[in-house]
């Protein structure tokens, strides 16, 4: 008996071939001997089966001795043994229809779980293997689960169902809803404007939800909500916003926040959360602000940084075009009685300069000038 695998919702064509290459009488029946369709001369006739409105044949092939049964919009319950009667012969074809669906939605938040469920006919024992867009293979039976979805899991998942040495392939498009970056650090000199951007890693036609930025200033003992906003069809409207700092938010996507100036009291880290309509859970992006200040008070030249810096970062004070006078893995360095000239304060990571502030030290009889 020939086995054919079909996909729920698809169309299948079951073949039946006579030895004579001409149009002769044929019938297709199901395992209960109920007629599905056949012919009377050049006319297609249909029987009382449940497939009535979904069954068809190709009249153009009858003259060649081919009498296919075409079943449209396949259902799991169409799984059956179909019998073609032609020339006093019976050809049996076993049709097995499978369906593969994602748990609730194909748009899932980063960190959520994806469950793929296989619908299969009674008596079948299929195996399933799925390949994610990043090449990860998962195997299972009736259900397959992937926990902690990552951004790289966005795209087309290809799943192969194997039964009786035959296979059928499903393709499911999964969209992982996330920000492009999980975390970012902005390095600024005191007084500079600060821009925070929160680009999304997905595009949907209508994006509605609400968000909030919580900020933990380094010198504060608790975090504060700096801004709350609504998102309606990709348009941003601010509900409540702090005035210290005078935070501003762009009205369109990508989500964009501006601090008019970087100040030590604002240095710290923030967490922007976005709750999307009809989704449980929230998207998160962390932002960090590091602020540098170089000052000269009397005979002391000081350079300080505030905010979340890694212990391996180096803070240095050097006279332009000279070796560093002081270089430490600390958040403040100073030079007593600095000589006149343009001094540079540098925050660097393995030799790469992340932040630089220049301060001009004048001869001792005059006051310092900050460029």
């Amino acid at each position: 008996k020939k086995v054919v695998l079909g996909k729920k919702g698809d169309t299948v064509e079951l073949t039946c071939t006579a030895s004579q290459k001409k149009s002769i009488q044929f019938h297709w029946k199901n395992s209960n001997q109920i007629k599905i369709l056949g012919n009377q001369g050049s006319f297609l006739t249909k029987g009382p089966s449940k497939l009535n409105d979904r069954a068809d044949s190709r009249r153009s092939l009858w003259d060649q001795g081919n009498f296919p049964l075409i079943i449209k919009n396949l259902k799991i319950e169409d799984s059956d043994t179909y019998i073609c009667e032609v020339e006093d012969q019976k050809e049996e074809v076993q049709l097995l229809v499978f369906g593969l669906t994602a748990n609730s939605d194909t748009h899932l938040l980063q960190g959520q779980s994806l469950t793929l469920t296989l619908e299969s006919p009674p008596g079948s024992s299929p195996s399933v293997q799925c390949r994610s867009p990043r090449g990860k293979n998962i195997q299972g039976g009736k259900t397959l689960s992937v926990s902690q979805l990552e951004l790289q899991d966005s795209g087309t998942w290809t799943c192969t169902v194997l039964q009786n040495q035959k296979k059928v392939e499903f393709k499911i498009d999964i969209v992982v809803l996330a920000f492009q970056k999980a975390s970012s650090i902005v390095y600024k000199k005191e007084g500079e404007q600060v821009e925070f951007s929160f680009p999304l890693a997905f595009t949907v036609e209508k994006l509605t939800g609400s968000g909030e930025l919580w900020w933990q200033a380094e010198r504060a003992s608790s975090s504060k909500s700096w801004i709350t906003f609504d998102l309606k069809n990709k348009e941003v409207s601010v509900k409540r916003v702090t005035q210290d700092p005078k935070l501003q938010m762009g009205k369109k996507l990508p989500l964009h926040l501006t601090l008019p100036q970087a100040l030590p009291q604002y240095a710290g880290s923030g967490n922007l959360t976005l709750a999307l309509e009809a989704k449980t859970g929230k998207l998160h992006q962390e932002v960090n602000l590091v602020v540098m200040r170089a000052t000269q008070l009397q005979k002391n030249l000081t350079c300080e940084v505030w905010g979340p810096t890694s212990p391996k970062l180096m803070l240095s004070l050097k006279l332009e075009n000279k070796e560093a006078k002081v270089s430490k893995r600390e958040k403040a360095v100073w030079v007593l009685n600095p000589e006149a000239g343009m001094w540079q304060c540098l925050l660097s990571d393995s030799g790469q300069v992340l932040l630089e502030s220049n301060i001009k030290v004048l001869p001792t009889w005059s006051t310092p000038v900050q460029p």
Epitope: A217, K224, K239, R240, V241, T242, D244, Q265, Y266
Partner: nanobody
Framework: EVQLVESGGGSVQPGGSLRLSCGAS????????IGWFRQAPGKEREGVSC????????YYADSVKGRFTISRDNAKNTVYLQMNSLKPEDTAVYYC???????????????????????WGEGTLVTVSS
């Protein structure tokens, strides 16, 4: 250790003036934002005024605008609240508090001072009555 001590409270007649002081120890007053808050008997604590660190921006509750003035003396490590044209409804315990930033927020065109700050003083009583 961060400590805040309020002084200058007392009794005054309507229309009178008082100057409250907030002395800080354990930190420099220009390092933190300092706010003044008040709580009248049987009422919730409310924001009065706040002065930001570094640039010294000032914020006031609508109910005290034009009557109260906040200022800072870095040398004395003290923040002041000058209260003029006092009204009976100004009667309350006045607290000073410190944080990295002033909890001054706007919703549309309505702006207000919230009470969320990190460090608090014990308070000083101001009574306005004839």
């Amino acid at each position: 250790e961060v400590q805040l001590v309020e002084s200058g409270g007392g009794s005054v007649q309507p229309g009178g003036s008082l100057r409250l002081s907030c002395g800080a120890s354990g930190f420099d007053v220009d390092y933190y934002a300092i706010g003044w808050f008040r709580q009248a008997p049987g009422k919730e604590r409310e924001g009065v005024s706040c002065i930001a660190s570094s640039d010294g921006s000032t914020y006031y509750a609508d109910s005290v605008k034009g009557r109260f003035t906040i200022s800072r003396d870095n040398a004395k490590n003290t923040v002041y609240l000058q209260m003029n044209s006092l009204k009976p409804e100004d009667t309350a315990v006045y607290y000073c508090a410190a944080d990295a930033t002033c909890p001054y927020y706007c919703s549309g065109s309505v702006c207000y001072l919230e009470t969320g700050m990190d460090y608090w003083g014990e308070g000083t009583l101001v009574t306005v009555s004839s």
